[in-house]
Interface confidence: medium
């Protein structure tokens, strides 16, 4: 039954670019100014995604396709199909409202986007640092003061700066 | 399509513990920070915690430090959120939710609510 | 820790412009984001950056920012923007803390 239905389902025969109008008889429209339709047996057309402000037009919408999106020159695209822009930074900084800054001291970014981050505490897991950290790189931490055998030696840590709302100008 | 599936909320009793799960699909799950932020009845939002991509850098709010451990599995697409020491004011919707920059929190779950009550 | 403040409400009359204000000593150094919250729902973002919208988010909202300062702005309020508005920047550990929130009625 299901399958007789579809068969005389005139909008199944819609292809791409085109909905089925059911203002005229279900005849198969074509998509108006600024709309497509993927896939055939459409009721409706989409309203195509518009590239404004930040972003820019990668590819134009056409009647069986979305437009694509990126971002302008010093700005990268984050999540699918690029629903965000983002200000490029480097590692070890982060952006501010004055642009982009160093990681102060105690703070990390390994990511070319986001935020510094305190580093990690080895201490309270009870480890010791292994590896110190750095403006674009977390600490290493290692086993245990106590696990180390006699005569080796850890780093020390330095006491993180817990304020990387500080960072120096 | 992003999906951040929840589970894990239930009632608990004060002092008791609580898993909770979040599993994530449609995004390069290992690339990003996770967040779990909650909302008690009738209140504001409140981040609680984060991990960043490998799994190694971790920070909480002070209102659950000690008690709460976030943790990933990035070969599940899966956060964690393992609570202890339950207390009453700890009632709340759970969010999990992910950040491109881990600056702006963009994909959220629907929530799971947890109940502290004797 | 840092606190955002928000009035906790403000109306609108339906087709004109309001201004949600949050204030906080981390709004110097660093932009707030803004969310949308309707009852029973996950917050959506809509305000991020400079005065940046993630893709979909209608361009009658929109956002400044001055000192230690964030408004979002919404143009010819709809029916459909009623509900609670967060702003969210860090703290001065480098967490993450959220304003009291607005509610917001359009009239």
């Known amino acids: 039954f299901e399958r007789t239905r579809s068969l005389q389902d005139p909008c199944s025969n819609c292809p791409a670019g085109t909905f089925c109008d059911n203002n005229r008889n279900q005849i198969c429209s074509p998509c108006p100014p600024n709309s497509f339709s993927s896939a055939g047996g459409q009721r409706t057309c989409d309203i195509c995604r518009q590239c404004k402000g930040v972003f820019r037009t990668r590819k134009e919408c056409s009647s069986t396709s979305n437009a694509e999106c990126d971002c302008t020159p010093g700005f990268h695209c984050l999540g699918a199909g690029c629903s965000m822009c983002e200000q490029d930074c480097k590692q070890g900084q982060e952006l501010t409202k004055k642009g982009c800054k160093d990681c102060c001291f105690g703070t990390f970014n390994d990511q070319k986007r986001g935020i510094c981050r305190p580093w990690t505490n080895c201490s309270l897991d009870g480890k010791s640092v292994l590896v110190n950290g750095t403006k674009e790189r977390d600490v290493v931490c290692g086993p245990s003061p106590a696990d180390l055998s006699p005569g080796a030696s850890s780093v020390t840590p330095p006491a993180p700066a817990r304020e990387p709302g500080h960072s120096p100008q | 399509e992003v999906q951040l599936v929840q589970s894990g909320g239930d009632l608990v009793r004060p002092g008791g513990s609580l898993r909770l799960s979040c599993t994530v699909s449609?995004?390069?799950?290992?690339?990003?920070?996770m967040h779990w932020i909650r909302q008690a009845p009738g209140k504001k939002l409140e981040w609680i915690s984060d991990?960043?991509?490998?799994?190694?850098?971790?920070h909480y709010a002070d209102s659950v430090k000690g008690r709460f451990t976030v943790s990933r599995d990035n070969t599940k697409n899966s956060l964690y959120l393992q609570m202890n020491n339950l207390r009453a004011d700890d009632t709340a919707v759970y969010y999990c939710?992910?950040?491109?920059?881990?600056?702006?929190?963009?994909?959220w779950g629907r929530g799971t609510l947890v109940t502290v009550s004797s | 820790s840092s606190e955002l403040t928000q009035d906790p409400a403000v109306s609108v009359a339906l087709g004109q412009t309001v201004r949600i204000t949050c204030q906080g000593d981390?709004?110097?150094?660093?932009?707030a984001s803004w969310y949308q919250q309707k009852p029973g729902q996950a917050p959506i973002l809509l305000i991020y950056?400079?005065?940046l919208r993630p893709s979909g988010i209608p361009d009658r909202f929109s956002g400044s920012s001055s000192e230690n300062t964030a408004s979002l702005t919404v143009t010819g309020a709809q029916a459909e923007d009623e509900g609670e508005y967060y702003c969210?920047?860090?703290?001065?550990?480098?967490?993450?803390?959220f304003g009291g929130g607005t509610q917001l009625t359009v009239l």
């Open positions: 950056g400079k005065d």
């Open positions: 449609g995004l390069p799950y290992s690339d990003y920070y």
């Open positions: 981390s709004l110097r150094r660093y932009y």
């Open positions: 939710a992910n950040a491109f920059s881990s600056s702006w929190f963009y994909n």
């Open positions: 991990i960043g991509p490998r799994g190694t850098s971790v």
């Open positions: 969210n920047s860090r703290d001065s550990s480098g967490n993450w803390v």
